[in-house]
């Protein structure tokens, strides 16, 4: 029975050339988190594994940093980084929980953080 919910940073914006922290938090479940995947569309950015720690995909090594916590920091942002990002929590015994974040990378300096929201 999957009872948990994922809270994410929601819709966020950041400036080109800057950095942003993607954060998800799993609550309302006692399930054990065995691994968290960070994905952009169907591309794997990084993995945080309970046994092995962090693994950053080679193609993102220069611009992705692990943390804080189970979150992910994207650096040297470009407009091409605009899009959907997903945190996938692999848990036992519940299974898979997915959170969605939409990032907009702006040319100007008017970047603002969106409201937090929950995904059941």
């Amino acid at each position: 029975m999957m009872t948990g919910t994922i809270e994410t940073t929601g819709n966020i914006s950041a400036e080109k050339g800057g950095s942003i922290i993607l954060q998800c938090h799993l609550s309302s479940t006692t399930a054990q988190v065995t691994q968290v995947n960070w994905e952009q569309q169907d591309q794997l950015l990084a993995i945080c594994n309970a046994d092995l720690g962090w693994h950053i995909s080679p193609s993102f090594k220069d611009r992705v940093a692990p943390g804080p916590g189970l979150g992910l920091t994207l650096q040297s942002l470009t407009v091409n980084d605009t899009g959907e990002y997903f945190c996938i929590y692999h848990t036992y015994p519940d299974g898979t929980y997915t959170g969605r974040i939409f990032l907009e990378v702006l040319e100007s300096s008017v970047a603002e953080h969106g409201a937090r929201f929950q995904i059941p």
């Epitope: 999957m2 054990q32 065995t34 691994q35 995947n37 169907d42 794997l44 993995i47 594994n49 309970a50 046994d51 092995l52 693994h55 692999h90 036992y92 015994p93 519940d94 299974g95 898979t96 997915t98």
Partner: antibody
């Protein structure tokens, strides 16, 4: 080339025990979670155990919890399945399989070892 | 547990044809369904995972679609080596569960 080779199967009486092994080669064994899956004589597949890359976490379905124990020796690149209190319904071909690094599905399987539980 | 119903259990087709195999989950499993091929004397092969992602090294004539409860494996322009047993498996929720299999034979 990734290779998984199971061994240790055989004929055992109900209530008996058996320990299966799976020798892994061609990849960094200690970086991957591993599973055991069995296939009944009727060709139905059933997942029976899983272990995390470092061996800290183990998972089982209710059908085998308390009777089966999955373990691994990363120094020997070997996965194990210890089975006790065996029942006739445990008769199957047992496969070890590697989980994808991203945890989505099992990307490599062994050829299997046969276990028959009968008096 | 999530029950997976796979259909048909048997399918006869000719090389060059396009076929589809379906799997239905007893509850939503998001996109988390995998497809495997089983052939005598060979180890099981992962074809598709996460519903539609093609495993590395698998020919593009294999494709997967669906989300929620209904999923489809499509094999277009069947090759002689495609005649085999196919299984789906949900990887959304423990315990991982499999469909009953589809035997694809040459007509």
């Amino acid at each position: 080339e990734v290779q998984l080779v199971e061994s240790g199967g055989g004929l055992v009486k109900p209530g008996g025990s058996l320990k299966l092994s799976c020798a892994a080669s061609g990849f960094t064994f200690s970086s991957y979670a591993m599973s055991w899956v069995r296939q009944s004589p009727e060709k139905r597949l059933e997942w029976v155990a899983e272990i995390s890359s470092g061996g800290s976490y183990t998972y089982y379905p209710d059908t085998v919890t308390g009777r089966f124990t999955i373990s691994r020796d990363n120094a020997k690149n070997t996965l194990y399945l210890e089975m006790s209190s065996l029942r006739s319904e445990d008769t199957a071909m047992y496969y070890c399989a590697r989980k994808r690094r991203d945890y989505y599905a099992m990307d490599y399987w062994g050829q299997g070892t046969s276990v028959t539980v009968s008096s | 547990d999530v029950q997976i119903t796979q259909s048909p259990s048997y399918l006869a087709a000719s090389p060059g044809e396009t076929i589809t195999i379906n799997c239905r989950a007893s509850k939503s499993i998001s996109k988390y369904l995998a497809w495997y091929q089983e052939k005598p004397g060979k180890t099981n092969k992962l074809l598709i995972y996460s519903g539609s992602t093609l495993q590395s090294g698998i020919p593009s004539r294999f494709s997967g679609s669906g989300s929620g409860t209904d999923f489809t494996l499509t094999i277009s322009s069947l090759e002689p080596e495609d005649f085999a047993m196919y299984y789906c498996q949900q990887h959304n929720e423990y315990p991982w569960t499999f469909g009953g299999g589809t035997k694809l034979e040459i007509k």
